[in-house]
Amino acid sequence: FNMDTRKPRVIPGSRTAFFGYTVQQHDISGNKWLVVGAPLETNGYQKTGDVYKCPVIHGNCTKLNLGRVTLSNVSERKDNMRLGLSLATNPKDNSFLACSPLWSHECGSSYYTTGMCSRVNSNFRFSKTVAPALQRCQTYMDIVIVLDGSNSIYPWVEVQHFLINILKKFYIGPGQIQVGVVQYGEDVVHEFHLNDYRSVKDVVEAASHIEQRGGTETRTAFGIEFARSEAFQKGGRKGAKKVMIVITDGESHDSPDLEKVIQQSERDNVTRYAVAVLGYYNRRGINPETFLNEIKYIASDPDDKHFFNVTDEAALKDIVDALGDRIFSLEGTNKNETSFGLEMSQTGFSSHVVEDGVLLGAVGAYDWNGAVLKETSAGKVIPLRESYLKEFPEELKNHGAYLGYTVTSVVSSRQGRVYVAGAPRFNHTGKVILFTMHNNRSLTIHQAMRGQQIGSYFGSEITSVDIDGDGVTDVLLVGAPMYFNEGRERGKVYVYELRQNLFVYNGTLKDSHSYQNARFGSSIASVRDLNQDSYNDVVVGAPLEDNHAGAIYIFHGFRGSILKTPKQRITASELATGLQYFGCSIHGQLDLNEDGLIDLAVGALGNAVILWSRPVVQINASLHFEPS
C-alpha cells in the first residue's frame, strides 16, 4: 500500500553466515541502527554465529564479536552455537538480547546444550550473560590425591604410573574437575594445588615429575587432615564435590588421630576413596588385617564403593578403571540418567522481553518437550516438568513437542500480562499455550489452541497485536508455516481475537494463490501503524514464495481487529535481484529516516532490507454545486 519498493536499502552480508536470519531496529539516543543476526558466522575456527550493527542510511555493518564472549568456570563449546538465532529488544532501555541456543559445555563425557544469551546494552556493549539452564556439572569436583611417599613404597615408578593413569580418566577443566596432590610420610607437602593446572595434559605433566620424598614414618591421619584443612582450601571451589583419594602401603604411625580426622572430613562432606597397597606386607609375609581395617575406616561408607586393595605397587594399574568409574558414579547420584531435564534445553531458541525480565524458549528441555524459562533481576524461574502436564500429558512425553519454539506475551484487562508459547510438534499438529508463571516453579495454563494439520508446525510463530494502542492485546496471530494445501507448503496464519478473557478463533489471513511452496507465516511481526490510520498493523513473511526468493504481506489493523486481506504484497524480486528467503524475519517499530513514518526491516539470506514508508494522502472529495 504505502511501503516504497523502488528505493529499498539492501544491506549485504554473508550468505554462508545467514546474515539476516534475524533483524531488529535499534535506537541509541536518536541514532538508528539495524541489529542483524548471523547465526552461522565464523569467529576464528569456530562457527559461533554473531550479531552485526548496521547503520540505517549508509556505511558498513560492524560485527559485535559476541561470539567471543566467554563464560568463566565452564568448559564451553561455542562451535555451532547459533548466536543470533533469536534477538529480543527491550524498548525501555534499548538494550537487546542475542541468544546462542546451541551453546554447549562439557560435563564429563557429555556435552550439554543448555544454550545461553548475551545481554547487550544500548551502546552495543556486552553487559551480561543470561544462561538460566546452565547447571553445575556433576563433574564439578575438587579431587585431592593423598600419596604415601614413605620409604616402604617401592617401586615409586608404579605409583607414578597409577597417578598418571587415573589423572587421564579425570575430566579436568573449568567447571569440572580440579586435582591437587599431597605427599606424606613423616611430613606432608603440597605437590601441586587444586587450581595450579587447568587441563589433563598439564596435570599429567606435573604428576610425572613428582618424586618420592621418603620418610621412616607413615602419618596417614596427618596427610588426610592436611588435605582436608589445607589442600581443599587452596584453590578449592565453593559448591564443588570434595573427593579425596588416599593411597598408602602400611598402618599409620598416627592412627589414634584418625577418629578426629575422619569426623572432620565427614563434617566437610569429603568423599574418601582409600587404596591399600599390600606390597610391603606380602614381601615380608605379614598379616595385613590391622592395616586393611584401618584403610576401610579411612574410606567412606560403604566400603565396597570406596575401598580398594592391591597386592603390590605394580597392581595399582588394575584398579584405575574401577576407581575412575566409582568416582564418576557420584555424577549419577539420585538421577535418572535416561531422561534429560535442562541439559539439552537449547535455551534462547526464542526470546521475548517482558517488564520484569526476559522469557526464553527452551525447546530441548524435558526430553525435547520444551519449556519456557524466565530470567529476572531477582533470579530465574524454571517451571518443573510436572507444571506442563495439564496440556502436555505424560503419554506424549516422547513426541518432542518443542514448547518454546516461540514465545511472546499478551495483555488482557482482567489477567494482566499472560505469557504465550508455541509447541509446533505437539501431537504432530502443534499447540499454543497461554499461561502465567509462578515463583514456586509452577504454571497456570489459562488456554490452549491446537493446530489442525499434522506437520503444519502450528505455533512455530506467534505474535500478539495491540491494534488500537490502548495497552491491551486485541489479536493473537499463530503461524503454521508448513501448512500443506493444494500440494504445497503454503502456510497459514490463524487469527484469534480477545473476547473477555479468552482468545477466540476468527479465521485466517489470506495469502496469494500461487502454486509454489511459500511458508506463509514463517515470520509474523506486529508493527506500528504503517498507513497512518492510527491502527497498528501486521506483516507476515513467506520466505519460500517465488521459488525461495520470498515475499512479505502487509495487513492493516482496523477497529480492534485485523483486515484479513493483505493491503500490500512485496516480493523480493521487486526490490533487488538475487534476494533469497526474503521475509524470514521482520521488525517494524521505529521511524528510521526521521520522516515521521514507521519503516520496515526485513531479513533475507545474506541481506537485511529496509523498506521506507511513504506518506498517505487522504483526499476527502466533496461536491459543491454553484449555483446551488
Partner: antibody, heavy 120, light 109 residues
Framework: EVQLVESGGGLVQPGGSLRLSCAAS????????IHWVRQAPGKGLEWVAS????????YYADSVKGRFTISADTSKNTAYLQMNSLRAEDTAVYYC?????????????WGQGTLVTVSS | DIQMTQSPSSLSASVGDRVTITCRAS??????VAWYQQKPGKAPKLLIY???SLYSGVPSRFSGSRSGTDFTLTISSLQPEDFATYYC???????????FGQGTKVEIK
C-alpha cells in the same frame, strides 16, 4: 635411654589449680602420644587424658573434662597437665606415659609418678 | 564407651602355679589390648601388647591370648617376683581413648 619424669605435684586446696609437667628424654615427643594416668590411694589405674604432640589432638576422661587441659611443647620435649577446679576426688598419684605405634599402641614407658593431694 | 571387666579382683597362688587373669570387653574391640604389672609404690610396667605379643625384656612365662571379647593373661609358672597387681588396658581404635580394667591382685597363698 627413654625416661619420663613428672613434677609439679603437691598439696592444693579444693577449687585450686596445679600444673604437672612430664619431661621426656631419650625419644622425640613429636612422634608419640603422651597419656596421663592417675591412681587414687589404694585404687586402680584411671586414665585421665592424652595428647598427640604432633597434631595437638586431645582426649579427656569424662571425670576431668572441662577442668583439666593437656598440652605439649615439642621444643622442650615436655607435656603438661593443667588442673583447675580441683576436688578431693582428684587426689592421686599422677603418671605420664608414652603411647606410640612401635609398641602397638600400648603404654611402654611410664614416669615415676607425682602425688597430688587436694585437701583443705 | 567400652568397659573392661577384669576378673578375679584378687587371687592367692603359690610359686610355680599357673595363673590366669581374664578381661572381658563390653563390646567387640580390636586386638589393641595390653597387660601391665604394678608393684606397690612403683609405676606400672608393660608386659603384653596387641593382646598376645610379649614386650621386650619380659620373661616368657607371661603370655596373652584372645578369644572373641575375652582377653587372658597367663603366668605359666608363678615366681616370687610376680606377686603384684595386674591391669588390662584397651585402646579404642583410631583414637587415643584408653580404658583400664579394675586390676587383679596376685598374692602369696
Amino acid at each position: 635411654e627413654v625416661q619420663l619424669v613428672e613434677s609439679g605435684g603437691g598439696l592444693v586446696q579444693p577449687g585450686g589449680s596445679l600444673r604437672l609437667s612430664c619431661a621426656a628424654s631419650g625419644f622425640n615427643l613429636y612422634s608419640s602420644y603422651i597419656h596421663w594416668v592417675r591412681q587414687a590411694p589404694g585404687k586402680g589405674l584411671e586414665w585421665v587424658a592424652s595428647i598427640s604432640s604432633y597434631s595437638s589432638y586431645t582426649y579427656y576422661a569424662d571425670s576431668v573434662k572441662g577442668r583439666f587441659t593437656i598440652s605439649a611443647d615439642t621444643s622442650k620435649n615436655t607435656a603438661y597437665l593443667q588442673m583447675n577446679s580441683l576436688r578431693a576426688e582428684d587426689t592421686a598419684v599422677y603418671y605420664c606415659a608414652r603411647y606410640w605405634y612401635y609398641s602397638a599402641w600400648a603404654l611402654d614407658y611410664w614416669g615415676q609418678g607425682t602425688l597430688v593431694t587436694v585437701s583443705s | 564407651d567400652i568397659q573392661m571387666t577384669q576378673s578375679p579382683s584378687s587371687l592367692s597362688a603359690s610359686v610355680g602355679d599357673r595363673v590366669t587373669i581374664t578381661c572381658r570387653a563390653s563390646q567387640s574391640v580390636s586386638s589393641a589390648v595390653a597387660w601391665y604389672q604394678q608393684k606397690p609404690g612403683k609405676a606400672p610396667k608393660l608386659l603384653i601388647y596387641s593382646a598376645s605379643s610379649l614386650y621386650s625384656g619380659v620373661p616368657s612365662r607371661f603370655s596373652g591370648s584372645r578369644s572373641g571379647t575375652d582377653f587372658t593373661l597367663t603366668i605359666s609358672s608363678l615366681q616370687p617376683e610376680d606377686f603384684a597387681t595386674y591391669y588390662c588396658q584397651q585402646s579404642a581404635p583410631y583414637s587415643s581413648l584408653i580404658t583400664f580394667g579394675q586390676g587383679t591382685k596376685v598374692e602369696i597363698k
